[in-house]
């Protein structure tokens, strides 16, 4: 049966069986800034293509053992949900990543920087269509790196970003502050803000919409079939970065603009249970969660 | 995220260091009364010191970039510091990666061209 | 409801072993770093060791480096302490603890067990 | 020996405030996120305060954290006979690569 998370994105008309457009994002590249991936996974195997930039800080602690399987659990997952033939948003999005988190999950501003300057580089070198970039990560707020994600949102790139796994206010967080990023707090089966322990999404005026971030099924690095679920803003990030490919795909001239102003249209309106969020916040907080357009645009998404 | 609401910094350090003092060594001096600023990760345990992101200001050229960090390391050496360009940035944001003391980000904020410096900091998964 | 459920406290001779489990319910084990926390009789918090999520790494106190070995079982939702070389200053009621958050930010603790007793004693 | 220290014991008539200092160094408080935790005679500790200053669901805003420098400390106002218990920081310490206690302090309500 379809996973709970690609049930709640979808159009009523598509819920019958299975969640299946086949091509969907088929004219968008996505590029995915995070941990290694395992590229040989059945869900993402020819779908992602792994580049050579790597910029990542030693791991902490001297007796950290590096497995291959732990150091890139996080990246595929992600490349999983985003564009994975089973249980991918966008079965049809290739995708590119960029390693720029270690195997304990840590990166730094300075290395994201350069991340995002590699794109912008590959952009104006090999001019293809529309770019989403996946920023499944965050740290304390920073000029410098919301200012490259400005750059690279004029230059007509499409930002997705994680608003942060804090239970605080995002603005506090980059690149989740950045105004020209899509900033997407997570949510979980219930339409609840999800809750990671004392922590949980983030909240506030820099989230633009909220996504399905809890339980989320998609690919294990623990072996080339295997699955697992995993939870997170990262989760969440990685559902609207699927659905802007099909957005995209479908109107690839959209401005960035355009395509917020869809994602918000689109969303389920006042379905949160806002009383999770500290009172100051909750009026503040967009009550939406992500979903892809009806099937009046039966021809345009799901070709 | 959520486009149309002005920035907010919230708890983000800035510290501003006037431009007053002649700097050795200077061919060209930062225009008149504008002042670099130096920023920093709120989350203390995020920090990197020693290494951080000097951003020029906004039409600045890639060879106007290095020059402005070979003249950076000159000056430090002058005062026995040893810095190291990590990397040049250009295409997004003019600038510089440069490990280097603390020490040397008054001297660093008084050059031609720049705009702030950011000391770096940790970004997690999420 | 979180919970967190310690067991095999006892009373043992100096130099023997023993095993301390803690089985955990209620939310994702696997996502969340795990530690040991002590309290000798009438004293304060002494922190023991940790775990990370996926186990890859540990952290120990100096007072019990090379004698005691945290470990996790994910599939099986519990967590475990191996005290070898036992002295009767080990003697104290131990603690497991959920690390706060999901990744490794070294945020505090913030589930605690009811606790288990050890007592080292000839 | 505890590298974290705290004064033995506060005390306060109910309704004053109580403050508990935990002074430590750059390689922990001064550079990792410090918590406090609360422990009644018998209990397990329970979390009041993480990341200096955020109180977890469920702790009422008499809690308050607060650090400057290599010392943190918590704020109890509105004192009640309830809030009688033995008080911890902790924070990670890098040089060690180990978390750490503060060394306790009792709070008595007069």
């Known amino acids: 049966s379809i996973p709970w998370n690609l049930e709640r994105i979808t159009p009523p008309r598509y819920r019958a069986d299975e969640y299946q457009p086949p091509d969907g994002g088929s004219l968008v590249e996505v590029y995915l800034l995070d941990t290694s991936i395992q590229s040989d996974h059945r869900e993402i195997e020819g779908r992602v293509m792994v580049t050579d930039f790597e910029n990542v800080p030693e791991e902490d602690g001297t007796r950290f053992h590096r497995q291959a399987s732990k150091c890139d659990s996080h990246g595929t997952h992600l490349a999983g949900v985003v564009s994975g033939r089973d249980a991918g948003v966008a079965k049809g999005a290739s995708m590119r990543s960029l390693r720029v988190l270690n195997c304990q999950g840590k990166g730094t501003v300075s290395g994201t920087l350069i991340g995002l300057e590699f794109i912008r580089k590959s952009q104006l070198v090999q001019p293809v269509g529309p770019l989403v970039v996946l920023l499944p990560l965050a740290g304390g707020y920073s000029r410098v790196l919301n200012a490259a994600c400005q750059r690279l949102a004029r230059a007509g790139v499409v930002l997705v970003t994680a608003a942060g796994n804090f239970r605080d206010d995002a603005c506090l967080y980059s690149p989740a502050s950045a105004p020209e990023v899509i900033t997407v707090g997570a949510t979980n089966a219930q339409d609840q803000p999800v809750t990671l322990g004392t922590l949980g999404t983030n909240f506030g005026r820099c989230v633009d919409l909220f996504a399905p971030g809890e339980d989320i099924i998609g690919a294990s690095s623990d072996c080339s079939t295997c699955f697992v679920s995993q939870s997170g803003t990262s989760q969440a990030a990685a559902h609207v970065a699927g659905i802007a490919a099909m957005m995209l795909s479908a109107e690839p001239e959209l401005t960035l603009a355009e395509l917020r102003q869809r994602l918000i249209h689109f969303s389920a309106k006042d379905v949160i249970n806002e009383a999770w969020f500290p009172e100051d916040q909750r009026v503040l907080t967009p009550n939406l969660v992500a979903a892809l357009p009806p099937s009046t645009h039966e021809n345009l998404y799901f070709q | 995220g959520a486009m149309g609401q002005e920035d907010e910094d919230g708890d983000y350090e800035e510290l501003v260091l006037a431009l007053r003092s002649e700097e050795d060594g200077l061919a060209e001096a930062p225009e008149h009364g504008t002042t670099a600023t130096f920023h920093r990760c709120a989350k203390d345990p995020w920090r990197l010191p020693g290494t951080y992101v000097v951003v020029l200001k906004e039409e600045t050229h890639l060879s106007q970039s290095e020059r402005t960090a070979r003249r950076l390391q000159a000056q430090a050496a002058r005062r026995g510091y040893l810095t190291k360009i990590l990397h040049v940035f250009h295409g997004l944001l003019p600038g510089f990666l440069v490990k280097m003391s603390g020490d040397l980000l008054e001297l660093a904020l008084k050059l031609p061209h720049v705009d702030y410096i950011e000391e770096d900091s940790s970004v997690f998964a999420q | 409801q979180v919970h967190l459920v310690e067991s095999g406290g006892g009373v043992v001779q100096p130099g023997r072993s023993l095993r301390l489990s803690c089985a955990a319910s209620g939310f994702t084990f696997n996502s969340f770093g795990m530690h040991w926390v002590r309290q000798a009789p009438g004293k304060g918090l002494e922190w023991v060791a940790l775990?990370?999520?996926?186990?890859?790494?540990?952290y120990y106190a100096d007072s019990v480096k090379g004698r005691f070995t945290i470990s996790r079982d994910n599939s099986k939702n519990t967590l475990y302490l191996q005290m070898n070389s036992l002295r009767a200053e080990d003697t104290a009621v131990y603690y497991c603890?959920?690390?706060?958050?999901?990744?490794?930010?070294?945020?505090?603790?913030?589930?605690w067990g009811q606790g288990t007793t050890v007592t080292v004693s000839s | 020996q505890s590298v974290l220290t705290q004064p033995p014991s506060v005390s306060a008539a109910p309704g004053q405030k109580v403050t508990i200092s935990c002074s430590g160094s750059?390689?922990?408080?001064?550079?990792?996120?410090v918590s406090w935790y609360q422990q009644f005679p018998g209990t397990a500790p329970k979390l009041l305060i993480y990341d200096y200053n955020k109180r977890p669901s469920g702790i009422p805003d008499r809690f308050s954290g607060s650090k400057s420098g290599t010392s943190a400390t918590l704020g109890i106002t509105g004192l009640q006979t309830g809030d009688e218990a033995d008080y911890y920081c902790?924070?990670?310490?890098?040089?060690?690569?180990?978390?750490?206690f503060g060394t306790g302090t009792r709070v008595t309500v007069l």
């Open positions: 750059s390689s922990n408080i001064g550079n990792n996120f």
């Open positions: 902790g924070t990670w310490d890098s040089s060690l690569s180990s978390y750490v």
């Open positions: 775990i990370w999520s996926d186990g890859s790494d540990k």
């Open positions: 603890a959920r690390a706060i958050a999901a990744l490794y930010y070294y945020y505090g603790m913030d589930v």
